[in-house]
Every structure is written in structure tokens, then in C-alpha cells.
């Protein structure tokens, strides 16, 4: 039920995780962690932010987008094959009980031996495809954990968070983002 | 490693409230984790409580939400259940635990609910 | 709230055997499941995550399996100190909820 990402050896990995804050700067902690959702918080954790900044990370493991408007992906650094696994997303919705979990599943490749062009390697590496399809409706609420009646109005995809990339049709069903307010 | 010990009155009378300390040792209780109490009635039927996280943030299980407070001393290393009103219904043993999955806990308190 | 069916509550055994545990929700859970194993006296100690992954020291007889609103756990070649209490666990919605537990014993 994860839904699943690939890169190569040597390149960077991109694991999507957005929400959109209820006011600007009125930001959501949220950690990210190697291994599936545990029942709190993340394990193993690897990156951490708080209501206002980036409170914990590791080497390797940083935001490339801009966190403070929810783009909480993950960005792996130089990824290797132990890399490959299961990674945790975990929005900590302010509210009773209002946790969104997002377990990610990214699979790692070995290099390719002849070096595709730079161009294509560049957005490879920044947002890798997803190897599986999903669909709109249930089978998308699959990666989403419970979502509650209050302080959620909207989920849309990751396209809608990136409709001026020129990557957005490669990558509008391969996410989903958590509206608040 | 994180080592967590309840403590409490054992027994308490109908409509009084119940107050229960776990100490931990080993671990911050600011640094990580929810910090939860769960509860196991006699018949063995687990129930989970609340919990207090590393930040302060609470969490309630909605049946108990008008009785029950978690809180903490983050100077002492402890954090705390309160449940107001109780009946013979919340005669059980409570255990405190903490991890992201559960992966510590104490030993247990019994606590009795009778007049 | 989503409610654990769990199955058997008891159960014999004898060593050796290979048993099965099943657990029922309400509700897809997403493999939002735990497993924990109770012996007399002790607390509960967690077991298997998400379904399949083993707990830090769990032996390898033990075993979880599932998806959508079924989920198992299967202990192969029993031994004497896996006889005990045992629990699922969903946290795919809050209140988290429990099964009601399976006992298994020496036949």
C-alpha cells in the first residue's frame, strides 16, 4: 500500500510530503523516519521541523522546497542501495488526534552503466517516477491514513502543488497533499 | 536504556480522582516519544489512554475525554495521569509506555475503585 | 472507533506446532498493525510492526500477514517461552484499539 519511488545510485532522491498551512508561516511539525509509520511520531528519525524552522537533521537528509509553505519533501543526498526502503512522512496536525501518515517506498537502482543525457538525469534525480500507478478514489486514501472531518477540508494531488513545473503531468498522481483550515 | 515506573495510591474510592506517576530513567521525556497511559481490566482487555508527546502536545482517547488529563514535569523526568469521577468501571492495572510502537513499558500499578 | 476482532481467544498447542492468530477490523486499516505479547505478571512487549516487521530480538518462527481488514500472525515451531497472551493493534484511526487477545497454551 506504499506508494513507491526509484533513483539511482549516485543521484538524489525525492520523496513527496506537502501540506498547505492554514496561514502563512502557521506551520505543522512534522518528522520524517526510516521504516513504516509507527504508531507516533517517526522512527529512526532523520529530519524534524517545528512550528517555525527545521529543528533536526541528519547529513544527507534535507528540504529542498520551501518548507514554510508546506513542501515538506525529502530530499536523499547520494543515495546508495541501503538507501532503498520504507520512509515516513508524519504531519502533526494541531487538534485531537489529527496525524497524517505517509509511508513512501523508495527503491534504489543500480547505476546504469552508459549515463542517460544531463538533462534528463537532472529531473530523474530531483523527481524520480513512481513505478506504480494509482488511481484517484480509494485506492489513493490507501497511502493516507485516516482523514479527519475537522481541520482537513481538501486533498489534492501533488500536480496541483506544482502546476508551473513543467514536471507536473510526470508527477500529478504521485501524491497527495494535506489542505488545513 | 528507557525504563519507566509507575506509581499510585492502589486504592480509591468511587467519585474521587485517581492520580498516577510515571518516572522514567534513561531518556528525556523532552527528547522524543509519546509518553502514553494504558490501561489493562481485569478479563485482560487493553485500552489505550493518552499520551503526552516530547513537545507537550496531548492526546485523548475520546471515551475518557472529559475525565482524564495528561501532564508533565519535565524537571523531574515524569509525567502524570489524572482521571476524575472514577467508578468500579476503572478498576484495572495501568502501565505507562512510550516509543514509537509501544516498546517500553513499566511494570504496572493496580489500581482498585471500591468504597 | 474501529473495532479488532481477534481469533481464536484461546487456543492448545503442543511444541513444535505451527499456529495462526487472526485479527479482523472494522475498516481497511492500511496495515496499521501491531502485534505485542503478554506473559503472566509482565507487561505487554512489543512484537511485529506494520504487519511484518519483526521487533529488535523477535525470533524469525514469528511471522505477520495481511492487508485491507485482515491481518495474521503466525508462530511456526513452537517453543515453550511462546506460550502467552497475545494482542493486535490498530493505529490507522485514533482512539487506538485493541483485540480483545488470544491465549495460547500447552496442550
Known amino acids: 500500500s506504499e506508494v513507491e519511488y526509484r533513483a539511482e545510485v549516485g543521484q538524489n532522491a525525492y520523496l513527496p510530503c506537502f501540506y498547505t498551512p492554514a496561514a502563512p508561516g502557521n506551520l505543522v511539525p512534522v518528522c520524517w523516519g526510516k521504516g513504516a509509520c509507527p504508531v507516533f511520531e517517526c522512527g529512526n528519525v532523520v529530519l524534524r521541523t517545528d512550528e517555525r524552522d527545521v529543528n533536526y537533521w541528519t547529513s544527507r537528509y534535507w528540504l529542498n522546497g520551501d518548507f514554510r509553505k508546506g513542501d515538506v519533501s525529502l530530499t536523499i543526498e547520494n543515495v546508495t542501495l541501503a538507501d532503498s526502503g520504507i520512509y515516513c512522512c508524519r504531519i502533526q496536525i494541531p487538534g485531537i488526534m489529527n496525524d497524517e501518515k505517509f509511508n513512501l517506498k523508495l527503491v534504489i537502482k543500480p547505476a546504469k552503466v552508459t549515463p542517460a543525457p544531463t538533462r534528463q538525469r537532472d529531473f530523474t534525480a530531483a523527481f524520480p517516477r513512481m513505478l506504480t500507478t494509482r488511481g484517484h478514489g480509494p485506492a489513493e486514501t490507501q497511502t493516507l491514513g485516516s482523514l479527519p472531518d475537522i481541520n482537513l477540508t481538501q486533498i489534492s494531488t501533488l500536480a496541483n502543488e506544482l502546476r508551473d513545473s513543467r514536471l507536473a503531468n510526470d508527477l500529478r498522481d504521485s501524491g497527495a497533499t494535506i489542505r488545513i483550515g | 536504556d528507557v525504563q519507566l515506573q509507575e506509581s499510585g495510591p492502589g486504592l480509591v474510592k468511587p467519585s474521587q480522582s485517581l492520580s498516577l506517576t510515571c518516572t522514567v530513567t534513561?531518556?528525556?521525556?523532552?527528547?522524543?516519544?509519546?509518553w502514553n497511559w494504558i490501561r489493562q481490566f481485569p478479563g485482560n482487555k487493553l485500552e489505550w489512554m493518552g499520551y503526552i508527546n516530547y513537545s507537550g502536545r496531548t492526546s485523548y482517547n475520546p471515551s475518557l475525554k472529559s475525565r482524564i488529563s495528561i501532564t508533565r514535569d519535565t524537571s523531574k523526568n515524569q509525567f502524570f495521569l489524572q482521571l476524575n469521577s472514577v467508578t468500579t468501571e476503572d478498576t484495572a492495572t495501568y502501565y505507562c509506555?512510550?516509543?514509537?510502537?509501544?516498546?517500553?513499558w513499566g511494570q504496572g500499578t493496580t489500581l482498585t475503585v471500591s468504597s | 472507533d474501529i473495532v479488532m476482532t481477534q481469533s481464536p481467544s484461546s487456543m492448545s498447542a503442543s511444541l513444535g506446532d505451527r499456529i495462526t492468530i487472526t485479527c479482523q477490523a472494522t475498516?481497511?486499516?492500511?496495515?496499521?498493525l501491531n502485534w505485542y505479547q503478554q506473559k503472566p505478571g509482565k507487561p505487554p512487549s512489543f512484537l511485529i510492526h506494520y504487519v511484518t516487521e519483526l521487533a529488535e530480538g523477535v525470533p524469525s518462527r514469528f511471522s505477520g500477514s495481511g492487508s485491507g481488514s485482515d491481518y495474521s500472525l503466525t508462530i511456526s515451531n513452537l517453543e515453550s517461552e511462546d506460550f502467552a497472551d497475545y494482542y493486535c493493534?490498530?493505529?490507522?484511526?485514533?482512539?487506538?484499539?485493541f483485540g480483545a487477545g488470544t491465549k495460547l497454551e500447552l496442550k
Open positions: 475498516q481497511d486499516i492500511v496495515k496499521n
Open positions: 493493534l490498530q493505529f490507522y484511526e485514533f482512539p487506538l484499539t
Open positions: 509506555t512510550s516509543g514509537g510502537n509501544f516498546d517500553y
Open positions: 534513561g531518556y528525556s521525556i523532552t527528547s522524543d516519544y509519546a
